[in-house]
Interface confidence: medium
């Protein structure tokens, strides 16, 4: 008996071939001997089976002795043995219809779980193997689960169902809803305007939800909500913003925030959360702000940084075109009685300068100038 695997919702064509290459009488029946379809001369006739309007044949092939049974919009319950009767012969074809569906939704938040469920006909014992867009293989039976979805899991999942040495392939498009970056860091000199961007890693037709930026300033004992906003069909509208600092927010995606100026008291870490309509859970992106200030008070030239810096970052003070006078893995460096000239304060990581602030030290009878 020939075995054919079909996919729920798809169309399948079961073949039936006569030895004579001409149009002769045939009919297809199911295992209950109920007639599905057949012919009367050049006319297609249909029997009382539950397939009725979903069943068809190709009249153009009858003259060549081919009498296929086409079943459209396959259902799991269409799994059966189909019998083609032609020239006093019976050809049996076993059709097994499988379905593979994702739990609830194919748009999932980063960190959530994806469950794929296999629908199969009674008596079948299929095995399933799925390959994620990043090449990860998962095997299972009736259900397959992937916990802690990551951004790289977005894309087409290819799942192969194996039964009786035959296989059928399913493709499921999964969209992982996340920000492009889990975390970002902005380095600014004191007084500069700060731009924060929160690009999303997905595109959908309509995007609705609400969000908030909580900020933990390094100098503050507790975190504070800096801004709350709504998102309606990709349009951003601010609900509430603190008076200090007064953030500005772009009206279109990607989410974009402007801090009027970088100040030591604003340096710290923020967490932008976005709750999407009809989704449980929230998207998160961490943002960090490091602020540098170079000052000269009396005979002391000081350079300080505030905010989340890693222990391997180096802070240096140097006179332009000269060797560093002082370099430390600390948040403040200073030089006593600095000589006149343009001094540079540098924050660097493995030799790469992340932030630079210049301060002009004038001869001792003058006051310093900050360019």
């Amino acid at each position: 008996k020939k075995v054919v695997l079909g996919k729920k919702g798809d169309t399948v064509e079961l073949t039936c071939t006569a030895s004579q290459k001409k149009s002769i009488q045939f009919h297809w029946k199911n295992s209950n001997q109920i007639k599905i379809l057949g012919n009367q001369g050049s006319f297609l006739t249909k029997g009382p089976s539950k397939l009725n309007d979903r069943a068809d044949s190709r009249r153009s092939l009858w003259d060549q002795g081919n009498f296929p049974l086409i079943i459209k919009n396959l259902k799991i319950e269409d799994s059966d043995t189909y019998i083609c009767e032609v020239e006093d012969q019976k050809e049996e074809v076993q059709l097994l219809v499988f379905g593979l569906t994702a739990n609830s939704d194919t748009h999932l938040l980063q960190g959530q779980s994806l469950t794929l469920t296999l629908e199969s006909p009674p008596g079948s014992s299929p095995s399933v193997q799925c390959r994620s867009p990043r090449g990860k293989n998962i095997q299972g039976g009736k259900t397959l689960s992937v916990s802690q979805l990551e951004l790289q899991d977005s894309g087409t999942w290819t799942c192969t169902v194996l039964q009786n040495q035959k296989k059928v392939e399913f493709k499921i498009d999964i969209v992982v809803l996340a920000f492009q970056k889990a975390s970002s860091i902005v380095y600014k000199k004191e007084g500069e305007q700060v731009e924060f961007s929160f690009p999303l890693a997905f595109t959908v037709e309509k995007l609705t939800g609400s969000g908030e930026l909580w900020w933990q300033a390094e100098r503050a004992s507790s975190s504070k909500s800096w801004i709350t906003f709504d998102l309606k069909n990709k349009e951003v509208s601010v609900k509430r913003v603190t008076q200090d600092p007064k953030l500005q927010m772009g009206k279109k995606l990607p989410l974009h925030l402007t801090l009027p100026q970088a100040l030591p008291q604003y340096a710290g870490s923020g967490n932008l959360t976005l709750a999407l309509e009809a989704k449980t859970g929230k998207l998160h992106q961490e943002v960090n702000l490091v602020v540098m200030r170079a000052t000269q008070l009396q005979k002391n030239l000081t350079c300080e940084v505030w905010g989340p810096t890693s222990p391997k970052l180096m802070l240096s003070l140097k006179l332009e075109n000269k060797e560093a006078k002082v370099s430390k893995r600390e948040k403040a460096v200073w030089v006593l009685n600095p000589e006149a000239g343009m001094w540079q304060c540098l924050l660097s990581d493995s030799g790469q300068v992340l932030l630079e602030s210049n301060i002009k030290v004038l001869p001792t009878w003058s006051t310093p100038v900050q360019p």
Epitope: E190, E192, Q193, R240, V241, D244, K246, L263
Partner: antibody
Amino acid sequence: QVQLVQSGAEVKKPGASVKVSCKASGYTFTDYVIHWVRQATGQGLEWIGEIYPGSGSAYSNAKFKDRVTITADKSTNTAYMELRSLRSDDTAVYFCARRGNGTGFAYWGQGTLVTVSS
Amino acid sequence: DIVLTQSPASLAVSLGQRATITCKAGQSVDYDGDSYMNWYQQKPGQPPKLLIYVASNLESGIPARFSGSGSGTDFTLNIHPVEENDAATYYCQQSYKDPLTFGQGTKLEIK
């Protein structure tokens, strides 16, 4: 101690412009927002706008948006508020202010009387 | 804009008694457990003086005779016991949302 010292009284004709200054001392000028508030004679207080002196980012009340420009000069620790196309109902005392540790305006300039008269 | 309505427009209180001024906001000025309402005192020819911030916090240097209360849309400034020096105009101000707005003022007279 924190001090905000404003420029002297001005008399202007309708249609002219006025620029009021506010010199800050006793704190790091770029660390705090400077606000501008006005008060017509015998009337209440009205917020005009504000500036972040470090970056020069300014925000103003929509009522004044097309007529007001708020600026700051870091080198002199001075904030400015310029009001254009003056009308007689712009006659008022103009104050600059700075918040304290809370959300209220704890420090105020002495006020600048601007009289608009033909 | 958030409209702040003060009442009464003026009041006369005897020395040593309690003065109560109310301020009603056109919408809630609460957020995250705080009420963004401030109170000022202003005497003729002087700039306003901050008395209370965030509804109930006393500004440093202000005597404890002044107290603020309320949340949401309804706020109260109490002065008790009233002193001669308290004769002035009092303003409420919201710092919840731009544009920042003030009440129309309440003139306090001491009898």
